[in-house]
């Protein structure tokens, strides 16, 4: 069951799908491993880099996209690859680094003036229209592209935290990702213990806000390891 994996908290500056797990009782649902919570560990350091397997772009970091590592390679084996810089070849927006988008097979700058005309009338401010698309581009690229135009408000669909307005982060919620509030002092957070321990998840909390860190609540020190309550506390 998913009872042990329904709540989690994204670590600051890491891609939204990252997160550990905390129990959320009473949720009667079962799921295959891919649909609601891609999960896995995307916390990679330069000196210990290991390719992260993925199924879709959202599972990768802000500066990555999901694809087969070799041209014409096994389509079943995909990993997170470094995003393409300006003027590099691309097939979709997600391949281009933040601040760029894919046009005519080339990553080009998505600066405000250049990009505004192409998306002006296509997407509502709040993503109220679930299925808006840009000239046949996919939902993922639509949403990420749109964000150079207007930052997502709380509850808006997003791809990454940079898509959201100040004070919000992009976090997974069931089958989607939406802008959620960054955690305030005293709010419950999820502490990620060791690298590699991040459980599958479908409900993420944001990271703790400026000047706060996710620590065990003082009166919970005696509790068992598995039930320790973490909250956002002053450094």
């Amino acid at each position: 069951t998913l009872n042990s994996v329904l709540n989690s908290n994204a670590i600051k500056n890491l891609p939204p799908p990252l997160g550990g797990a905390a129990g959320h009782p009473g949720s009667a649902v079962s799921a295959a491993p891919g649909i609601l919570y891609p999960g896995g560990n995307k916390y990679q350091t330069i000196d210990n880099y290991q390719p992260y397997p993925c199924a879709e772009d959202e599972e990768c970091g802000t500066d990555e996209y999901c694809a087969s590592p070799t041209r014409g390679g096994d389509a079943g084996v995909q990993i997170c690859l470094a995003c393409r810089k300006r003027r590099k070849r691309c097939m979709r927006h997600a391949m281009c680094c933040p601040g760029n988008y894919c046009k005519n097979g080339i990553c080009v700058s998505s600066d405000q003036n250049h990009f505004r005309g192409e998306i002006e009338e296509t997407i509502t401010e709040s993503f109220g229209n679930d299925h808006s698309t840009l000239d046949g581009y996919s939902r993922r690229t639509t949403l990420s592209s749109k964000m150079y135009h207007t930052k997502g408000q709380e509850g808006s669909v997003c791809l990454r935290s940079s898509d959201c307005a100040s004070g919000l982060c992009c976090a997974r919620h069931f089958w989607s990702k939406i802008c959620k509030p960054v955690l305030k002092e005293g709010q419950v957070c999820t502490k990620h213990r060791r690298k590699g321990s991040h459980g599958l998840e479908i409900f993420q909390r944001c990271y703790c806000g400026e000047g706060l860190s996710c620590r065990i609540q003082k009166d919970h020190h005696q509790a068992s390891n598995s039930s320790r309550l973490h909250t956002c506390q002053r450094h």
Partner: antibody, heavy 117, light 107 residues
């Protein structure tokens, strides 16, 4: 324009199998999750489950798990809900709904399933 | 599962009236509440998502408020086309669950 066109009403006997469909158009089928929702006569809506058409992954409400199967065919941009053995209590209106956010924005017109001996 | 309880179950009102429908969750669901409108023989339509965000194409006379466990759908000035059944839905915890509905009838 997003459109979800569901198959026609069905009249079945208990124990029979059934598959109803939801054909989509106006968007890229694999980019949105597809949900099935049941509404028994005069009752509220019940979420049955969801499928990610891009990879076939499914998730079910525990209440319906094992009794129904959700599937999708990418080539025809169609989602399916099927029963291997219908019960009288399966008589209801069934809706498909496709979405990206945690809400159901686009709905099919519904398929009425009648089960009687 | 989280239980959603709507009140009243039915409501009679006149065109131009201000109408309020409430929805109570059995546990805290933060802002993860949606409202739908359903007319007889038709599929539901999304009105409001994430507690108060108006879905595209929905008239501004509809509004949502509340937080935690108690939520409200308000129609500021009833129009003839607003007579229907309204459902709330929580999407805080799987499985998503709906209220039993509030039938809004013409007085």
């Amino acid at each position: 324009e997003v459109q979800l066109l569901q198959s026609a009403a069905e009249v079945k006997r208990p124990g029979e199998s059934l598959r109803i469909s939801c054909k989509t158009s106006g968007y890229t089928f694999t980019e949105y999750t597809m949900h099935w929702v049941r509404q028994m006569p005069g009752k509220e809506l019940e979420w049955m489950g969801v499928i990610d058409p891009s990879n076939g992954d499914t998730s079910y409400n525990q209440k319906f798990k094992g009794h129904v199967t959700i599937s999708a065919d990418k080539s025809s941009s169609t989602a399916y809900l099927q029963w291997s053995s219908l019960k009288a209590s399966d008589a209801a209106m069934y809706y498909c709904s496709s979405t990206t956010g945690p809400w159901f924005a686009s709905w099919g017109q519904g398929t009425l399933v009648t089960v009687s001996s | 599962d989280i239980q959603m309880t709507q009140s009243p179950s039915s409501l009679s009102a006149s065109v131009g009236d201000r109408v309020t429908i409430t929805c109570r969750a059995s546990q805290d669901i933060s802002n993860y509440l949606n409202w739908y409108q359903q007319k007889p023989g038709k599929a539901p339509k999304l009105l409001i998502y994430y507690k108060s965000r108006l879905h595209s194409g929905v008239p501004s006379r509809f509004s949502g408020s509340g937080s935690g466990t108690d939520f409200t759908l308000t129609i500021s000035s009833l129009q003839p086309e607003d007579f229907a059944t309204y459902y709330c839905q929580q999407v805080h915890t799987l499985p998503p669950t709906f209220g039993q509905g509030t039938k809004l009838e013409i007085k």
